[in-house]
Interface confidence: medium
């Protein structure tokens, strides 16, 4: 997180840490973690942790490790021979089904999914919270959770920023309605290592709750504007995937 500040896991209890690759995710119920497809495409058996503000290895040993049962990548995500050259991050969303249910508590609890009503349509200027252990201004990786509050911006703002290390012509980068552009204020942004974490917005119908409006996906340059997977467009796929892959007990 660039331009952010120290955060406590108690304020982001849905935050999941992936250690390979170094990334994030969001707990959405006791059996399921939501993340970005690009986080899990290269590792279908990710090790995840919840409930710890610090990801120093000695601290992780004391936090709750989650074991995956299966990874479900959105069918619209294009799997590439050489993922390093990716210019299309459309449908950057995945679900991880857990082997065992997560025990909830003050440092571990799920984030809501967006509702289907127009109340959950984001407007430019709407504020969301991002969190993660990715690159900061001072560190390649954060040991302690960082967070920032940033506004939704028009997609063109993201298009206007020059890609820092283009793997193709600027025109090759794909921008779709499945993406949210956010940031641009005081250099606050998500960055390498924050991928898959939630862009959390206050629930318009219950101010005590947050919902995952977006997932950290990609960006032209850290510290400018970032692109987030628009979770609202995938609620049907999320619900269907969870229903088809749940045990009778969960239903």
């Amino acid at each position: 997180i660039i331009g952010g500040s120290d955060a406590d896991i108690k304020n982001f209890p849905w935050q999941v840490f992936f250690d390979n690759p170094w990334a994030g995710g969001a707990l959405i119920n006791e059996y399921w973690v939501l993340t970005a497809a690009h986080v899990v495409e290269g590792n279908r058996e990710p090790t995840m942790y919840v409930g710890s503000t610090s990801v120093q290895t000695s601290r992780l040993a004391k936090s709750k490790m989650l074991t995956p049962e299966h990874v479900f990548i959105h069918p619209g995500w294009k799997l590439l021979e050489v993922p390093e050259g990716r210019t299309n991050f459309d449908n950057d969303i995945a679900l991880v089904r857990l082997k065992d249910p997560v025990k909830m508590g003050p440092t571990v609890s799920p984030i809501c999914l967006p509702g289907t009503s127009s109340d959950y349509n984001l407007m430019d200027g709407d504020l969301g919270l991002i969190s993660g252990w990715g690159r900061t201004e001072k560190r390649d990786r954060a040991v302690r959770l960082k967070a920032a509050r940033l506004p939704v911006a028009p997609l063109r703002k993201c298009k206007e920023v020059k890609v820092e290390k283009p793997t193709a012509d600027a025109e090759a980068y794909v921008f779709t309605p499945n993406m949210i552009c956010a940031g641009g204020e005081k250099g606050m942004d998500s960055c390498k290592g924050d991928s898959g974490g939630a862009f959390a917005v206050q629930d318009p119908n219950d101010k005590t709750k947050f919902y995952a409006a977006g997932l950290v996906s990609w960006g032209p340059q850290c510290g400018t504007y970032g692109l987030y997977t628009r979770v609202k467009n995938y609620v049907d796929w999320i619900m269907k995937t969870m229903q088809e892959n749940s045990t009778p007990r969960e239903d």
């Epitope: 170094w22 390093e84 390649d140």
Partner: antibody, heavy 119, light 111 residues
């Protein structure tokens, strides 16, 4: 598992340049940071710098700012270190190293490349 | 630059005894409550091997006879009981501030 394979030994003339490579297997270099470390014969370790292969961000130790150039090619999963205007002081073993899942230490190292500068 | 000073320069320790190695940083290497201090072992012809990270955490697979401690500027490494295979050079390294720096690396010999 994670492995870093470095290019073979080099014998070069003073004033010349040399390019060393470090090819990773078992992980994508864009997910990590590649560091380079120098070790002169019978001497200690010196940090040259690091590169983030995802966006080519580099950080050099001041001492190596004009001597070394780090690059990375994510398509071949390879990082390179170029050393220019070589002198006998540059005769050393050069290691590449990565964090792995750690946050600021090196669990993984290449086997090292010996560069010998001699007329 | 943060200067790392290790002592002694050389030590010879009998099998089964304790080998204490000290590392002092010219300024604090702590950040956000953690010490960015790591220890490596190097044998001739081999790359360094991580022993201890963040001052006191034993790397996976490293025997428990190795222990590290300290915070701020003083970081001792202890090997006890010393075994034959521990004959090597030991480097401390700080990664709190660029440029990352290593200590001089005392050589441990087993008597």
């Amino acid at each position: 598992q994670v492995q870093l394979q470095q290019s073979g030994a080099e014998l070069v003339r003073p004033g010349a340049s040399v390019k060393l490579s470090c090819t990773a297997s078992g992980f994508n270099i864009k997910d990590d940071y590649i560091h380079w470390v120098k070790q002169r014969p019978e001497q200690g370790l010196e940090w040259i710098g690091r590169i983030d292969p995802a966006d080519d961000h580099t950080k050099y130790a001041p001492k190596f700012q004009d001597k070394a150039t780090m690059t990375a090619d994510t398509s071949s999963n390879t990082a390179c270190l170029q050393l220019n205007s070589l002198t006998s002081e540059d005769t050393a073993v050069y290691y590449c190293a990565i964090y792995g899942s750690g946050w600021a230490w090196f669990p993984y190292w290449g086997q090292g490349t010996l560069v010998s500068v001699s007329a | 630059d943060i200067v790392m000073t290790q002592s002694p320069d050389y030590l010879a320790v009998s099998l089964g005894q304790r080998a204490p190695i000290s590392c002092k940083a010219s300024q604090s290497v702590d950040y956000d409550g953690d010490s960015y201090m790591n220890w490596y072992q190097q044998k001739p012809g081999q790359p360094p091997k991580l022993l201890i990270y963040a001052a006191s955490n034993l790397e996976f697979g490293i025997p428990t006879r190795f222990s590290g401690s300290g915070f701020g500027t003083d970081f001792p490494l202890n090997i006890h009981p010393v075994e034959e295979e521990d004959a090597a050079t030991y480097y401390c390294q700080q990664s709190n501030e660029d440029p990352w720096t290593f200590g001089g690396g005392p050589k441990l010999e087993i008597k």
